[in-house]
């Protein structure tokens, strides 16, 4: 029975040219995490394997950095980076848990303006 839940950073926005941290956290389960996959729509960005560590997909190695923790840092953001990101936790005995993050990439001035009106 799958009792765990994934908490994510939810909907986030960041400036074009800037960087953003994608974070997920699996809680409420004693399942062992064997691997975390980070995907953007249908593209695999990176994995963190419990035995062998981080592996970044060749097409993203210049703009993706592992961490912090099981999170992922996206750098030099472009408008093409906007959209859905998924963290997929491979665990046993539970199976897979999936979290979703939606990233909006804004022009610098818009991002700064939006930040003044964020609800804490």
């Amino acid at each position: 029975m799958m009792t765990g839940t994934i908490e994510t950073t939810g909907n986030i926005s960041a400036e074009k040219g800037g960087s953003i941290i994608l974070q997920c956290h699996l809680s409420s389960t004693t399942a062992q995490v064997t691997q975390v996959n980070w995907e953007q729509q249908d593209q695999l960005l990176a994995i963190c394997n419990a035995d062998l560590g981080w592996h970044i997909s060749p097409s993203f190695k210049d703009r993706v950095a592992p961490g912090p923790g099981l999170g992922l840092t996206l750098q030099s953001l472009t408008v093409n980076d906007a959209g859905e990101y998924f963290c997929i936790y491979h665990t046993y005995p539970d199976g897979t848990y999936t979290g979703r993050i939606f990233l909006e990439v804004l022009e610098s001035s818009v991002a700064e303006h939006g930040a003044r009106f964020q609800i804490p």
Epitope: Q35, N37, I47, N49, D51, H55, P58, H90, Y92
Partner: antibody, heavy 121, light 107 residues
Amino acid sequence: QVQLVQSGTEVKKPGASVKVSCKASGYTFSSYAITWVRQAPGQGLEWMGWISAYNGNTNYAQKLQGRVTMTTDTSTSTAYMELRSLRSDDTAVYYCARVDFWSGYNYFDYWGQGTLVTVSS
Amino acid sequence: DIQMTQSPSSLSASVGDRVTITCRASQGISNYLAWYQQKPGKVPKVLIYAASTLQSGVPSRFSGSGSGTDFTLTISSLQPEDVATYYCQKSNSAPLTFGGGTKVEIK
């Protein structure tokens, strides 16, 4: 096409070491892991350990810990497995295989042809 | 460590028969299980991964099922070329232990 080509048959004396090579072609070597599996004559498959060709991280079977070392050379797309302090029960065919871990399911999708290592005095 | 137990250790069946091999994990592993076929004198070959996903190029008479601790490999209609030893393997994390194998022969 993906190919893993292993080094040839070895005959060793007890207490010696052996180093088996596994040359990969047909894919981006550093994007996958390599595992080593052995099979004693007439016996089943025994997992020995695996190594990431991306970062060099390893994980070995507990019973071989301290006697086995797995390495990779990305410049030649070659994986190596060294086994030390050989005993007669290390006589086996040694296989390397590519691990598809991107899916999260860690299965061995391509295998080398095997290297027979005989340990005999 | 999680142990993998296969049964039977050997079986003999007629061409066209439905053949079932079982694999049991000592603890739950969800669907992190692969099946391999090793023909006499040949290199092992993956048939199924993720418990039920058929590897590309594998005939559709092979199928896998199960989750948790109990898994099954089924050959829907045994063919002469299926004579081999079949191994299950836990594929979640190290150690990536194999079952003891099931030898399939033709009657």
